[in-house]
C-alpha cells in the first residue's frame, strides 16, 4: 500500500451567503460575506449566475471590472465598495426582474486564499396589506388591499376572538392584474364583522408572508402591518 500526502496546498477562506428574495421593479440585495483581507487591492469578488455565460459582477483591485459582465446585468449591479475591506461582498441588484431568480455564486479570492458559496434568489412581488372598514357596504365589512403580489398569493382571514374559525364562507378575494401585466393587486373583503375584535388579513406566496391587522372598537380603529420574507437560509 502506497500512501501519498498532498504537499502542495492552497488556503481556503470562509464565504457565507444568505438565500433571499427580490421584489420585482425594486432594488434587491444578494448577501455575501467573507474573511476580510488587509489590502483592498488583493481582493477579487466575482458574482456568477447558474446558466449565465458572462459574469454578474466583478470587483477587482479596488474597482468594478465589468468587461466580462453578462448583458442581462448591464448597468444593474454594484457592490458596496467601502465595505469590501471589512468582508462585505454583497451585491446590489437594481430594478429586479422576474428572470433574475436562480442560483448565484459568490466567489472570493484574497491573499489568504479562495472561497465560494451559492445562494438561492427568488423573485416576485410582495407588498404590505392595509385593512380598512368599508363604510360603503350594507353591513359591517373589512377591506384588505395590497397593491403588488406575484405569484398569486393565498389570502386567509383570522380573528382574535374566534380563533381557529374559517372565514372563507364570509370573505371574497379578487386579484386584479396591474398595468405591467405581471403583478396583481389583491383585494379581499370580509363580511359580518363584529365590534371589539381584532381581525388579521394574511397574504402569502412562496416568497413572502404579509399580515394586516385591524382592531375595531366603538371609540377607535387601530391598524398594524408587517411583512416577512420566507426561506432566508444561510450557507
Amino acid at each position: 500500500l502506497i500512501i501519498g500526502f498532498g504537499i502542495s496546498g492552497r488556503h481556503s477562506i470562509t464565504v457565507t451567503t444568505v438565500a433571499s428574495a427580490g421584489n420585482i421593479g425594486e432594488d434587491g440585495i444578494l448577501s455575501c460575506t467573507f474573511e476580510p483581507d488587509i489590502k483592498l487591492s488583493d481582493i477579487v469578488i466575482q458574482w456568477l449566475k447558474e446558466g449565465v455565460l458572462g459574469l454578474v459582477h466583478e470587483f477587482k483591485e479596488g474597482k468594478d471590472e465589468l468587461s466580462e459582465q453578462d448583458e442581462m446585468f448591464r448597468g444593474r449591479t454594484a457592490v458596496f465598495a467601502d465595505q469590501v475591506i471589512v468582508g462585505n461582498a454583497s451585491l446590489r441588484l437594481k430594478n429586479v426582474q422576474l428572470t433574475d431568480a436562480g442560483t448565484y455564486k459568490c466567489y472570493i479570492i484574497t491573499s489568504k486564499g479562495k472561497g465560494n458559496a451559492n445562494l438561492e434568489y427568488k423573485t416576485g412581488a410582495f407588498s404590505m396589506p392595509e385593512v380598512n372598514v368599508d363604510y360603503n357596504a350594507s353591513s359591517e365589512t373589512l377591506r384588505c388591499e395590497a397593491p403588488r403580489w406575484f405569484p398569486q398569493p393565498t389570502v386567509v382571514w383570522a380573528s382574535q376572538v374566534d380563533q381557529g374559525a374559517n372565514f372563507s364562507e364570509v370573505s371574497n378575494t379578487s386579484f386584479e392584474l396591474n398595468s405591467e401585466n405581471v403583478t396583481m393587486k389583491v383585494v379581499s373583503v370580509l363580511y359580518n364583522v363584529t365590534i371589539n375584535n381584532t381581525y388579521s388579513c394574511m397574504i402569502e406566496n412562496d416568497i413572502a408572508k404579509a399580515t394586516g391587522d385591524i382592531k375595531v372598537t366603538e371609540s377607535e380603529i387601530k391598524r398594524r402591518s408587517h411583512l416577512q420574507l420566507l426561506n432566508s437560509k444561510a450557507s
Partner: antibody, heavy 123, light 104 residues
C-alpha cells in the same frame, strides 16, 4: 491550508481493479470539481474524470467503460476505480481540486494537487 | 472531442529570454483554458486560468493570452527556476501534449 492526501495499491496484476482514494483536508468540499489525472512514465498528463460533492460525474470517453469515480461527503473523500487494468495503465495517478461547479460557466483550473501515487501493472 | 495541440514540443532557451508557448484548440473553447508548470517528479502547478488570469503567487513574468482556438503562455524573462514542462488544459478536461523548456 487545503491539502489532498491520496492512497491506494501501488502494484497490480493485469485484469485487476485499480483503487485509489483522495481525502480533502482544510477546506470545503462543495463548490469544486474533484478530479483524477494520470501520467504514464515519460509522457504527458491525461484527464481521467471528475466528480462534485453531489456525485455528478464526467469521464474521459476513452476510459469511461472502465472508470468509476465516487464521493463520500461525510469523510470529505473521493475515490477512483479503474477495472481490467493492463500494462498501459501504469502511471502516476494524481487527485486534484478544480475551481468549477456544475451549471456555472467558469473554470479556474486545478489549483490543489495530491503528490501522486505510482501505480505499476505487471504480471 | 476537442483536441489541444501545443507547440513547440521542446523549446531550447537561455536565462533572460522571452519565451512563448502556443496551444491550439480544434474548436472554440472561449477563454476556458488553464496553463500548468510541471517539474520532474512533482505534481503540476497552476499558473494561469481563464486564459489570462494569473494564479495567486505566480510571478508576474508569466502571462497568458488568447481566446477561441488560439492561446499563448509567455515568460517575459526566463529564470533558472522556469526550466520545466508546460501544459495547457481546456475546461475541466483534456490536456495538451506538453512543451518542455530546456536550457540552450
Amino acid at each position: 491550508q487545503v491539502q489532498l492526501q491520496q492512497w491506494g495499491a501501488g502494484l497490480l496484476k493485469p485484469s485487476e481493479t485499480l483503487s485509489l482514494t483522495c481525502a480533502v483536508y482544510g477546506g470545503p468540499f462543495s463548490g469544486y470539481f474533484w478530479s483524477w489525472i494520470r501520467q504514464p512514465p515519460g509522457k504527458g498528463l491525461e484527464w481521467i474524470g471528475e466528480i462534485n460533492h453531489s456525485g455528478n460525474t464526467n469521464y474521459n470517453p476513452s476510459l469511461k467503460s472502465r472508470v468509476t469515480i465516487s464521493v463520500d461527503t461525510s469523510k470529505n473523500q473521493f475515490s477512483l476505480k479503474l477495472s481490467s487494468v493492463t500494462a498501459a495503465d501504469t502511471a502516476v495517478y494524481y487527485c486534484a481540486r478544480a475551481g468549477g461547479d456544475y451549471g456555472f460557466y467558469y473554470y479556474y483550473g486545478m489549483d490543489v494537487w495530491g503528490q501522486g501515487t505510482t501505480v505499476t501493472v505487471s504480471s | 472531442d476537442i483536441q489541444l495541440t501545443q507547440s513547440p514540443s521542446t523549446l531550447s532557451a537561455s536565462v533572460g529570454d522571452r519565451v512563448t508557448i502556443t496551444c491550439r484548440a480544434s474548436q472554440s473553447i472561449s477563454s476556458w483554458l488553464a496553463w500548468y508548470q510541471q517539474k520532474p517528479g512533482k505534481a503540476p502547478e497552476l499558473l494561469v486560468y481563464k486564459a489570462s488570469r494569473l494564479e495567486s503567487g505566480v510571478p508576474s513574468r508569466f502571462s497568458g493570452s488568447g481566446s477561441g482556438t488560439e492561446f499563448t503562455l509567455t515568460i517575459s524573462s526566463l529564470q533558472p527556476d522556469d526550466f520545466a514542462t508546460y501544459y495547457c488544459q481546456q475546461y475541466n478536461s483534456y490536456f495538451g501534449g506538453g512543451t518542455k523548456v530546456e536550457i540552450k
